[in-house]
């Protein structure tokens, strides 16, 4: 099983992925989410299921959550977008975009991150790096630091399998490996990040965690590019 | 602030079932795992399973499969744990655990006829 | 399933002292989590990962091992630290605890 740290991952390089976001319900993590402009922040539209009588924030620049940090700052929200054809009942048009009260200060350790827009497929094989605050272990441990793990992309027709996911990933998802190393609880709305580039954001299904049968589900982000850029327009 | 908020001490005829209750505040259970701990002066403490509150995912000690079922009800953020067909060898204090790190305060559950 | 044995199974420490008890495993195990029960209260929770300590834990508790072996020591003992401390592995289904080691103050 898995050693901790996202699961079979380990801590980030503090302040090193500068467009990582915390979602943040009456103060305290609900899910990750991605700086994708200067006053927006793109995560899983799940996440807010049960944020309905809550207040929604946004923490960026942050590595712990819980020390102080000079470069951490908590932004409420604006606006919430939850992608139109998100489903309480299914991992499609798993996206929302959240607006920022202001802009966000950039500096080293707050800085959007650019995303796909070329749809085209991640090859298999690719490595790519998830990070977030979500659980760390089959115990349900929550971590106070970022976390992150490598993962390979998964073909589609693999992920498909009856014995895996069962056709439920359409062009508009993607897949990586989930032996051991995975994105879990609290890790969703996060990003998956190959070459430097915003690939995919992870779902918020209530998907088993670190099973090799259960790949990790990623929303494709270049299949939602006109949607993104209507809504930050 | 965690806090988990176990229902009251339970006194049990052999042959019997119980079900005991641990309500959640401070933290959503469907964003953890919940599990269950029996303690008795001599068998020590032992890991009865554990819940994904999200999808209602279980795995059992397989010592404890078919004597303890573990459920979770969302909308009250509860976790429950129904002990059947009980003898006195289940009579113990039952813990419920969020992430295996905060403790409930224990229930006492004592089987005598 | 992975048995855990703890030694002692009862120590005693003056104020101030040195306290190591230690946790083996019969197959390696990769983590161990640490818990403190003093009478009459739920366990609470002391060490994560072997080394890591849980929030509000006191500096004097520190936690190390790898494979089979792993060890809990207090660098000064205090009159608080009496208690029942049990080691715990999560690496191996069925999750396991250790019996315990009652530390008493002299």
């Known amino acids: 099983p898995p050693r901790g740290r996202i699961l079979g991952g380990r801590e980030a390089e503090a302040h090193a992925r500068p467009y990582m976001a915390s979602v943040q319900l009456n103060g305290a993590h609900l899910c990750g989410g991605v700086l994708v402009a200067e006053q927006w922040v793109l995560s899983a539209a799940h996440c807010l299921e049960d944020a309905a009588d809550g207040k929604v924030q946004v923490l960026l620049g942050a590595h712990s959550l819980s020390q102080p940090e000079p470069s951490k700052r908590l932004y409420d929200v604006l606006r919430a977008v939850p992608h139109p054809d998100s489903q309480p009942d299914t991992i499609d048009h798993d996206l929302l975009l959240l607006q920022l009260s202001e802009k966000a200060t950039l500096g080293p350790a707050v800085r959007p991150l650019p995303w796909q827009r070329v749809d085209r497929d991640v090859a298999p094989g690719t490595l790519c790096d998830v990070a977030g605050w979500g659980i760390v272990n089959h115990a349900g441990r929550r971590p106070d630091s970022l976390q992150h793990v490598l993962l390979p992309v998964l073909d589609r027709a693999t992920c498909n399998r009856r014995t895996h996911h069962d056709g439920a990933i359409t062009e508009r998802l993607m897949c990586a490996e989930s032996n051991r190393r995975d994105s879990c609880k609290g890790d969703s709305g996060g990003p998956l990040v190959c070459g430097g580039v915003l690939e995919g954001v992870v779902t918020s299904g209530s998907r088993v965690c670190g099973n090799r049968k259960k790949p990790g589900i990623y929303t494709r982000v270049a299949s939602y590019a006109a949607w993104i850029d209507s809504v930050l327009a | 602030e965690v806090q988990l908020q176990q229902s009251g001490a339970e006194l049990v005829k052999p042959g019997a079932s119980v079900r005991l209750s641990c309500t959640a505040s401070?933290?959503?259970?469907?964003?953890?795992?919940m599990h269950w701990v029996s303690q008795r002066p001599e068998r020590g403490l032992e890991w009865i399973g554990k819940?994904?509150?999200?999808?209602?995912?279980?795995k059992y000690d397989p010592k404890f499969q078919g004597k303890a079922t573990i459920t979770a009800d969302t909308s009250s953020n509860t976790v429950y744990l129904q002990l059947s067909s009980l003898t006195s060898e289940d009579t113990a204090v039952y813990y419920c655990?969020?992430?295996?790190?905060?403790w409930g305060q224990g229930t006492s559950v004592t089987v005598s006829s | 399933q992975s048995v855990l044995t703890q030694s002692p199974a009862i120590m005693s420490a003056s104020p101030g002292e040195k306290v190591t008890m230690t946790c083996s495993a019969n197959?390696?195990?990769?983590?161990m989590y640490w818990y403190q029960q003093r009478p009459g209260s739920s366990p609470r929770l002391l060490i994560y990962?072997?080394?890591n300590l849980a929030s509000g834990v006191p500096v004097r508790f520190s936690g190390s091992g790898s494979g089979t072996s792993y060890s809990l020591t207090i660098s000064r003992m205090e009159a608080e630290d009496a208690a029942t401390y049990y080691c715990?592995?999560?690496?191996?289904?069925?999750?396991?605890f250790g019996g315990g080691t009652k530390l008493e103050i002299k």
């Open positions: 197959s390696s195990v990769s983590d």
């Open positions: 655990l969020n992430a295996m790190e905060y």
């Open positions: 990962d072997t080394s």
């Open positions: 401070g933290f959503n259970i469907k964003h953890t795992y």
């Open positions: 715990q592995q999560w690496s191996t289904y069925p999750w396991t």
């Open positions: 819940i994904d509150p999200a999808n209602g995912n279980t």
